[in-house]
């Protein structure tokens, strides 16, 4: 057959769906690869063709759209399963073509099983709630397009293995779950089960997300540099190793980039002709406040290096701060006191440091 623009296997879209539940999968061509939508393509006389390769097989085969109760169907640019079966797992291809044009992309579809605590291999989205911040809501995700607005589904919410009822601060409100006030104890996996009728049949949609309670913007502060500080002096002799830690606390801020960096004499360490290494470590509190430590290390420091200015800088969405380290050359104690030796003929006193 004639050439076809093949976008290959789009592993960025690793689609996971639950066994025995409806799934609607849009052809990724129109979402991520082509500059026109399905309606435009359809109007231009292009046809969308679906086929698949079963798991652990190489053979591409057409999708059977003649199954009982139209279990698999196509509607515009959407492939529908009503419902899925475990052996629907495989690589699916949608191809858009006419006599002069052809474009196709494949994507993996994994049908997964869940247990009665909603555990499964499914990758879970994370929703962050601010600690003690007032009413916040999570919404049952990815249920749009499954049923018309005239249908009134039932929605049951669970935390882990338990149906949410009589929880002090968590209230189910249809598609939303309201947290009157969020605490660390609200961390966990929350599942909504949406049940709806369609053409005389009943379907479930199960959606699980992870709730993570994080620091509140009410309590957020600019970065705080704990080290270097005014109480510690880095006093070294030439030839010794100089180690200066820069330890910075960052309040949790949604979508904030936290940065820590050193300057030496106002320049980046890379721009200074000395052998500097910088090692960074990051730790998080339970509410995702962050502590970053960058240790500046000069293996064999020179007297020149000990005269330089070492400044730790930190920046977040809340502001920028800087703190200089106090670095000194250690003054060696004299081997003996010259004045005493000369003036009084005293014995030599050796001071070893």
């Amino acid at each position: 057959s004639e050439r076809c623009d093949d976008w290959g296997l789009d592993t960025m879209r690793q689609i996971q769906v639950f066994e025995d539940e409806p799934a609607r999968i849009k052809c990724p061509l129109f979402e991520h690869f082509l500059k026109f939508n399905y309606s435009t393509a359809h109007s231009a006389g292009l046809t969308l063709i679906w086929y698949w390769t079963r798991q652990d097989r190489d053979l591409e085969e057409p999708i059977n759209f003649r199954l009982p109760e139209n279990r698999i169907s196509k509607e515009k640019d959407v492939l529908w399963f009503r419902p899925t079966l475990l052996n629907d797992t495989g690589n699916y291809t949608c191809m858009l073509r006419n006599t002069t044009y052809c474009s196709k992309v494949a994507f993996p579809l994994e049908v997964v099983q869940k247990d009665s605590c909603f555990n499964s291999p499914m990758k879970l989205p994370v929703h962050k709630l601010y600690i003690e911040y007032g009413i916040q809501r999570i919404t049952c995700p990815n249920v749009d397009g499954y049923f018309p607005s005239s249908v009134k589904p039932t929605i049951t919410w669970y935390m882990g293995c338990y149906k949410i009822q009589n929880f002090n601060n968590v209230i189910p409100e249809g598609m939303n779950l309201s947290f009157l006030i969020a605490f660390i104890s609200n961390n966990g996996n929350y599942t909504c089960v949406v049940t709806y009728p369609e053409n005389g049949r009943t379907f479930h949609l199960t959606r699980t997300l992870t709730v993570k309670v994080v620091g509140s913007p009410k309590n957020a502060v600019p970065p705080v540099i704990h080290s270097p500080n005014d109480h510690v002096v880095y006093e070294k002799e030439p030839g010794e190793e100089l180690l200066i830690p820069c330890t910075v606390y960052f309040s949790f801020l949604m979508d904030s980039r936290n940065e820590v960096w050193w300057t030496i004499d106002g320049k980046k360490p890379d721009d200074i002709p000395i052998d500097v290494t910088i090692n960074e470590s990051i730790s998080h509190s339970r509410t995702e406040d962050e502590t970053r430590t960058q240790i500046l290390s000069i293996k064999k420091v020179t007297s020149e290096d000990l005269k330089r200015s070492y400044v730790c800088h930190a920046r977040s969405a809340k502001g920028e701060v800087a703190k200089a380290a106090t670095v000194k050359q250690k003054v060696p104690a004299p081997r003996y006191t010259v004045e005493l030796a000369c003036g009084f003929g005293a014995t030599h006193h050796h001071h070893h440091h």
């Epitope: 247990d115 009665s116 555990n119 009134k152 009822q165 009589n166």
Partner: antibody, heavy 117, light 107 residues
């Protein structure tokens, strides 16, 4: 095809215990909760409690808390309901039912337990 | 526990009649009410969930309505196979509770 098949009828003496089984087939057993509901002769339905086969957790109707134990054996896909200290008013048909998302869509055929001296 | 009061406890009707059964909850249960049909010697069968949604395979002559505390099951045109006992149940909060049942008999 989803099926819940319960054990046969039982006649018990007051003060004794009964253990009713419910064998599930046609679906993945540990994906659904199993509830137990009873119905005294000519009466309505009465919820006794449920078991979550994954966690092993059971929740009971307080009316039965001290007397009922609901368990599940994942290896045989079987749920059990044990009721102790039986009295004549426990004479009833006992049903197991599979639940998901608040839907009691599949029920066992029922087990008649008669408590009589 | 939430009480579910079902009425009437029994009714006589003819084939083709419109039949209405009501259920009243002692507290707000939202839409979390199911209706079941039970024939003598058989286990209950789910008809309606979420107060108004017909379960798979249930004929369209069965409909449910209501919210909060007042719920109704309607059979628009009674058929011979509909003579049975009907139960409402709240699936809102433990312990789940059921009405006393309504027996629909042939007139």
């Amino acid at each position: 095809e989803v099926q819940l098949v319960q054990s046969g009828a039982e006649v018990k003496k007051p003060g004794s215990s009964v253990k009713v089984s419910c064998k599930a087939s046609g679906y993945t057993f540990n994906s659904y909760w199993i509830h137990w509901v009873r119905q005294a002769p000519g009466q309505g339905l009465e919820w006794m409690g449920y078991n979550n086969p994954t966690s092993g957790y059971s929740e009971y109707n307080q009316k039965f808390t001290d007397r009922v134990t609901i368990t599940a054996d994942k290896s045989t896909s079987t749920a059990y309901m044990e009721l102790s200290s039986l009295r004549s008013e426990d004479t009833a048909v006992y049903y197991c039912a599979r639940e998901y998302g608040d839907l009691f869509a599949y029920w066992g055929q029922g087990t008649l337990v008669t408590v009589s001296s | 526990a939430i009480q579910m009061t079902q009425s009437p406890s029994s009714l006589s009707a003819s084939v083709g009649d419109r039949v209405t059964i009501t259920c009243k909850a002692s507290e707000n249960v939202g839409y979390s009410v199911s209706w079941f049909q039970q024939k003598p010697g058989k286990s209950p069968k789910l008809l309606i969930y979420g107060a108004s949604n017909r379960y798979t395979g249930v004929p369209s002559r069965f409909s449910g309505s209501g919210s909060a505390t007042d719920f109704t099951l309607t059979i628009s045109s009674l058929q011979p196979e509909d003579f049975a006992t009907y139960h409402c149940g709240q699936i809102y909060i433990y312990p789940y509770t059921f009405g006393g049942g309504t027996k629909v008999e042939i007139k």
